[in-house]
């Protein structure tokens, strides 16, 4: 059952896990969330009647039966972990703590104009989990305008404590707002040499990447394959840091993999959502319940049901026994891994689903493709709408994508002459124009945000969000799109694709059905040598072929430029101008999303 | 609700400098644009320039070198100043409000005269 | 810069008749952003212009049905499908495609 309220003046007894600090209550339920075991916790306010040294102590409990009886005392505060609950997670936390000091290792100190300029700073560092900041009335005259960075094992304070006029807050690494690098490469036959922070068993190194992105401190990692010569080391996954940020020595040795941590990169790929199976492969832990099952789909099925499973192994049933049901072991550890790996013993194994809410909904596989044609199938770009203007009367006025559920994001010239967000809708899941009719269901507009900057497409800034009046409810034929990360600038994307209902010539009407091409991205170098007397700025982004024959066109304004990269689909561009349509020479310019991804956060996280 | 309204002297010397205020009320001078429109007497519209919402402006090209588009938000103002008048500059002027882009003129000033006379 | 010539530049109508006033450019008004930044304003006498059309053929709210606007590239027309007395005024064009702006020089619809 997913309780999300705080209980005030209650702890819960017993069953601790873990004690770590944490700035408030609200943090200690995300701690409690992203930790592998904790269900419960309790939270110590500060109070006059409590002893100083428990001030912000964040217990995390753990509970067989998922509940633990409730004791009063004044300044606690107790609660549930979102693990129970079925909606989207985030770590994210943008709050600015006044007058707390978060301890911990300070290994950087520098001047700061101001606290966000620290936060910046934190977030752009490899190693830092927080930071504190000195202000200007802080008393010590050396100390103002100081900027520690901080980092600790787990990625939380080590102790917190009341300090006048200095400020604290968290990296927003996991707000998709480092522009560190993101790195997805997996380095074969090569072992990382520094030191190491943690291992863990792991079934692949894609598993051992995605332990090492989510662990505080892990900044890469080596793994050893199932056929790594020394036994005792198999599918060891190791979780290294260096001081640098970057591994100082690369070792050539076969059957080990290498990779780095995907913080930066995390708001567009999974990162918690191990989803594969592993066939004639045994994980071993704790076992939690045996359970019949018809299939091993079925057995990850009652894992992710059960809050406290972390994985499974199925073994199939033997011919005719147990009506063709096999036995599910439903298990769990201290770190959410298996303690052991075993291979050849006709299992099937795999993790819990439960945490795949904690990763961006966009980057959930969608259907397969067909590839070839230009009409789309239906659930083929489960992000592309149609908007509607209803005034003077109802027609397909530009394309645009969902980004969020309650985020449209278009091109701002698409509301020439849109005088009111009342006149709008915003149609999903349409494969056909033809489908709209009165009793259709839409999204309203609640309201147009238009870039500040904008003046006409042609000079760039050509970007706009819409908020929509109700939640979109994800379904295979209406998700969002991930937007790029900042970390993925260098990305070349190679398999991209521009979607719309728009005109297929220069004079033509709005198609019936939505239309799809493949079309090459184009340096912007190339781009402005054929837009010599338009300046094609880096924000924004070129895609069409030499000999022209595919473009976007009057219609699709608004729409996406798609990419798809390691297997996730991004909105790369939004279909902004260009001369004519498909004319040689003459490529279609987007608005390059990458550089708005601040702009579009500012807008949509808002309070 | 939205309100715009010119005001400034109605009569200025030959070589001085016009200056015009239009204060608007119901909107906001960082969301909206706001243009200056001028009219010779019994001729057509003639369009001055604009104050993007982002505090750029940009000016006819026939009046650039002499005029200066300014605002105060705090205020709700949009300055227009047209320097070393002549009696070709009298007109009614009037400041109009883009649309959600920067057009189209959704809302009017109800204009004011400027004679430029001695 | 853009020069829109508007024809005629004085049109008496019998109420009840239909009326059109073109609109030429000195360039195309298609903006590369697929949209056509071209508007029909009225000046009735004494007061200040009020929009009638943008996009070339796009009514604002609360403009009446009998007014209708077509064309592209370089050429526009505005029609009054049945001219009412309270039409009277001028008429311009206005194009937002290309800096800086530029109005028609005006039609004047009178009723004969």
């Known amino acids: 059952e997913c309780v999300t309220q705080l209980l005030k003046d209650t702890c819960f007894e017993g069953g601790d896990i873990t004690t770590v600090f944490t700035p408030s209550a609200k943090y200690c339920q995300v701690v409690c969330t992203y930790h592998p075991r904790c269900l419960l916790f309790t939270f110590t306010a500060e109070s006059p009647s409590e002893d100083p040294t428990r001030w912000f102590t964040c217990v995390l409990k753990d509970s067989v039966t998922e509940t633990l009886p409730r004791v009063n005392r004044t300044a606690a505060i107790s609660g549930y972990s979102f693990k129970q609950c079925s909606h989207q997670i985030s770590a994210c936390n943008k709050d600015i703590y006044v007058d707390l000091d978060m301890k911990g290792i300070n290994y950087n100190s520098s001047v700061a104009k101001s606290a966000q300029e620290c936060q910046e700073r934190c977030t752009d560092d490899v190693h830092c989990h927080f930071f504190t900041y000195a202000t200007r009335q802080f008393p010590s005259l050396e100390h103002r305008n100081i900027c520690l960075l901080k980092h600790t094992q787990t990625g939380t304070p080590t102790r917190i404590t009341k300090l006048d006029k200095v400020v604290s807050g968290f990296s927003l690494k996991s707000c998709a707002l480092s522009n560190l690098a993101c790195i997805r490469d997996i380095f074969p036959n090569t072992v990382f040499a520094d030191s190491n922070i943690d291992s863990v068993m792991a079934p692949d190194a894609f598993v051992c990447g995605r332990i090492c992105t989510h662990h505080p401190g892990c900044l890469f990692f080596t793994f050893f394959s199932q056929e790594w010569p020394k036994e005792s080391q198999r599918n060891l996954c190791l979780l290294k840091t260096s001081e640098s940020g970057l591994p100082s020595t690369r070792i050539k040795k076969s059957k080990a993999l290498s990779g780095f941590s995907l913080q930066s990169c995390r708001h567009s790929i999974p990162v918690f959502c191990h989803s594969s199976f592993y066939h004639d492969t045994d994980f071993l832990g704790e076992e939690l319940d045996i359970v019949a099952a018809k299939s091993h789909e079925a057995c990850q099925k009652l894992c992710t049901n059960a809050v406290r499973c972390q994985f499974f192994t199925y073994t199939p049933a033997q011919a005719s026994c147990n009506e063709g049901k096999g036995k599910c072991y439903l298990k769990l550890s201290s770190n959410g891994s298996p303690t052991k790996i075993l291979h050849g013993r006709g299992g099937i194994s795999g993790y819990t689903l439960r945490l795949c809410k904690m990763d961006n909904e966009c980057t959930t596989k969608i259907k397969p493709r067909i590839v070839g044609g230009t009409a789309s199938v239906r659930g083929e770009w489960p992000w592309q709408v149609t908007l509607h203007t209803t005034s003077p009367t109802q027609r397909h006025l530009c394309g645009g994508s969902i980004i969020g559920n309650q985020w449209i994001l278009t091109a701002a010239h698409c509301f020439y002459g849109v005088e009111s967000p009342k006149i709008l809708r915003v149609y999903s899941g349409i494969l056909n124009q033809s489908e709209i009719k009165e009793d259709t269901s839409f999204f309203g507009v609640q309201e147009i945000i238009i870039h500040d900057q904008y003046k006409m497409a042609e000079s760039g800034y050509d970007i706009a969000l819409l908020k929509l009046e109700t939640t979109v409810n994800y379904t295979d034929s209406q998700r969002p799109i991930c937007l790029p990360s900042k970390g993925d600038r260098n990305v070349i994307y190679t398999d991209c694709w521009v979607t719309g209902w728009g005109y297929r010539k220069l004079r033509d009407k709005i198609q019936n059905t939505l239309q799809k091409a493949k079309i090459p991205l184009v340096t912007n170098e190339e781009c402005q040598k054929r837009y010599r007397g338009h300046k094609i700025t880096h924000k924004m982004i070129c895609a069409g072929y030499r000999e022209g024959g595919k473009d976007a066109c009057k219609g699709d304004s608004g729409g996406p430029l798609s990419c798809k990269h390691n297997e996730v689909w991004h909105l790369v561009g939004i279909t902004s101008w260009g001369e004519g349509c498909a004319q040689r020479e003459r490529p279609g310019v987007y608005t390059n999303v990458v550089e708005y991804v601040d702009w579009i956060l500012e807008k949509t996280q808002a309070v | 609700q939205v309100q715009l309204q010119e005001s400034g002297p109605g009569l200025v010397k030959p070589s001085e400098t016009l200056s015009l205020t239009c204060t608007v009320s119901?909107?906001?001078?960082?969301?909206?644009?706001v243009h200056w429109v001028r009219q010779p007497p019994g001729k057509g519209l003639e369009w001055i320039g604009i104050?993007?919402?982002?505090?750029?402006?940009y000016y006819n090209s026939s009046l650039k070198s002499r005029v200066t588009i300014s605002r105060d938000t705090s205020k709700n103002q949009v300055s227009l100043k047209l320097s070393s008048v002549t009696a070709a500059d009298t007109a009614v002027y009037f400041c109009?409000?883009?649309?959600?882009?920067?057009?189209?003129?959704?809302?009017w000033g109800q204009g004011t005269l400027v004679t430029v006379s001695s | 810069d853009v020069v829109l010539t508007q024809t005629p530049l004085s049109l008496p109508v019998t109420p009840g008749e239909p009326a059109s006033i073109s609109c030429r450019s000195s360039?195309?008004?298609?903006?590369?952003?697929?949209?056509?930044?071209l508007e029909w304003y009225l000046q009735k006498p004494g007061q200040s212009p009020q929009v009638l059309l943008y996009?070339?053929?796009n009514r604002l709210s609360g403009v009446p049905d009998r007014f209708s606007g077509s064309g592209s590239g370089t050429d526009f027309t505005l029609k009054i499908s049945r001219v009412e007395a309270e039409d009277v005024g001028v008429y311009y064009c206005?194009?937002?495609?290309?800096?800086?702006?530029?109005f028609g020089q005006g039609t004047k619809l009178e009723i004969k």
């Open positions: 206005f194009q937002a495609t290309h800096g800086p702006f530029t």
């Open positions: 119901g909107f906001s001078l960082t969301t909206y644009h």
């Open positions: 104050m993007w919402r982002d505090g750029d402006t």
């Open positions: 360039q195309s008004l298609e903006s590369r952003d697929g949209n056509t930044y």
């Open positions: 996009g070339v053929s």
């Open positions: 109009a409000r883009g649309g959600t882009l920067t057009t189209p003129f959704t809302y």
